[in-house]
């Protein structure tokens, strides 16, 4: 049986229904069987877990996703073996295997792989600071969301209107969420906001930086 699945990965927003398309061509016999299984990201296919079987005219959802899986067409004997997964969770991200067996059609292994990413908006990030907050010193402002798929990008902005910092004194990394402030001056003091963004939305946190004379330094 030759199985056809989309070549592009599938993305579905958190809580929505994912439709994992799988089709095939064969003269369906009484021995026809369909199995859908799931493997977590980064794990080998050999570690897949069954989530649904169809055999002998009956459908058998199985495992932790059993209440949320069904077939677009039941029985799946018309050439369409598409899986529906409702109320998707972050843990549903991974590779899904559609395997069709129909002896004596052994033309190929009857296997198709679909990568699903569950899209999750960024959670409220945590803002933190480390380093010297005295004039002339350097400090790192960090920002990180514990949730978000795809991984959020981070953008730091200083709130209010202040003199433009000298070039090179403010360097940020959108991937790590880190903002490096060098050669601090009293005018570096203020509130800094980090915005974590992905295609599902954004979330932010704020941090107030107080730059002091060299004898003392603190962050509120």
């Amino acid at each position: 049986v030759e199985v056809k699945v989309p070549t592009e990965p599938l993305s579905t927003p958190l809580g929505k229904t994912a439709e994992l398309t799988c089709t095939y061509s064969t003269s369906v016999g009484d021995s026809f069987a369909l199995e859908w299984s799931f493997v977590q990201p980064g794990k080998p296919i050999s570690e897949s877990h069954p989530i649904l079987y169809f055999t002998n005219g009956h459908l058998y959802p199985t495992g932790s996703k059993s209440k949320r899986v069904s077939l677009l067409q039941n029985p799946p004997t018309v050439g369409v073996a598409t899986l529906k997964l409702t109320d998707v969770h972050p843990s549903d991200t991974g590779t899904y295997l559609c395997q069709v067996n129909n002896p004596p059609d052994f033309y190929t292994n009857g296997l198709g792989l679909i990568n699903l990413t569950v899209l999750v908006p960024p959670s409220n990030p945590l803002c933190s600071q480390s380093g010297q907050t005295s004039v002339g010193g350097s400090t790192a402002l960090r920002c990180s969301s514990s949730e978000g798929a795809p991984k959020p990008v981070y953008n730091w902005v200083r709130l209010g209107t202040f003199p433009t910092p000298s070039p090179g004194s403010m360097v940020q990394d959108e991937v790590s969420g880190q903002l490096i402030l060098t050669n601090l001056s009293l005018t570096s003091s203020g509130t800094y906001r980090c915005v974590a963004t992905n295609q599902m939305g954004s979330a932010s946190c704020e941090l107030t930086l107080s730059v002091t004379e060299p004898s003392q330094g603190r962050v509120a």
């Epitope: 056809k4 061509s25 003269s27 369906v28 016999g29 018309v78």
Partner: antibody
Framework: EVQLVESGGGLVKPGGSLRLSCAAS????????MSWVRQAPGKGLEWVSS????????HYPDSVKGRFTISRDNAKNSLYLQMNSLRAEDTAVYYC???????????WGQGTLVTVSS | DIQMTQSPSTLSASVGDRVTITCRAS??????LAWYQQKPGKAPKLLIY???TLPEGVPSRFSGSGSGTEFTLTISSLQPDDFATYYC?????????FGQGTKVEIK
């Protein structure tokens, strides 16, 4: 040599019923998916039903669903098509056809004519 | 349902001609396409399946090509026995449907 011989065609009134038969020989019937395909006079081909090797799975297009029933008796090497609530547009030559491993039709019978007319 | 459209509907040709018939599917059917030949009063005969595979006994002057939505049947050198009607059929997902046919007649 593969042989498929249809029978049971004839003239029937609209709303009436008819049962077609197909006698198969020359191959292992119980291992083969089978179909009925029809052809209205002067028109093209239309698939009307299929059945899996052991009869567990049957399929129909919308045009006949609920009116036609395909069945088989592997002990008798026979395929059947029960046609109910017949309409004028069901008038056609009905062919019995064997399916290959993929659902194309590698052997066909000679056909039997069904005429639905008052 | 997947619609199959053949062109031309009728084709006039002479013995020895190279003849090409086109079949288009309304959506991607990969290579799941069969071709049949039918003569008046006779049952269809399988010529090609999987878009390009010839069953045993079909003359090599017949060939098929294409994938996705566009397919062709070619007769490299038309013989007297080839004057007939030709049908394409997708063998992908149910319902399996046929093209409306192409009649190859003597010019």
């Amino acid at each position: 040599e593969v042989q498929l011989v249809e029978s049971g065609g004839g003239l029937v009134k609209p709303g009436g019923s008819l049962r077609l038969s197909c006698a198969a020989s020359g191959f292992t019937f119980s291992n083969s998916g089978m179909s009925w395909v029809r052809q209205a006079p002067g028109k093209g081909l239309e698939w009307v039903s299929s059945i899996s090797d052991g009869g567990l799975y049957t399929h129909y297009p919308d045009s006949v669903k609920g009116r036609f029933t395909i069945s088989r008796d592997n002990a008798k090497n026979s395929l059947y098509l029960q046609m109910n609530s017949l309409r004028a547009e069901d008038t056609a030559v009905y062919y019995c056809a064997r399916q290959g491993v993929r659902p194309f039709f590698d052997y066909w019978g000679q056909g039997t004519l069904v005429t639905v007319s008052s | 349902d997947i619609q199959m459209t053949q062109s031309p509907s009728t084709l006039s040709a002479s013995v020895g001609d190279r003849v090409t018939i086109t079949c288009r599917a309304s959506e991607n059917i990969y290579s799941y396409l069969a071709w049949y030949q039918q003569k008046p009063g006779k049952a269809p005969k399988l010529l090609i399946y999987n878009a390009e595979t010839l069953p045993e006994g079909v003359p090599s002057r017949f060939s098929g090509s294409g994938s996705g939505t566009e397919f062709t049947l070619t007769i490299s050198s038309l013989q007297p026995d080839d004057f007939a009607t030709y049908y394409c059929q997708h063998h992908y997902v149910i319902p399996w449907t046929f093209g409306q046919g192409t009649k190859v007649e003597i010019k």
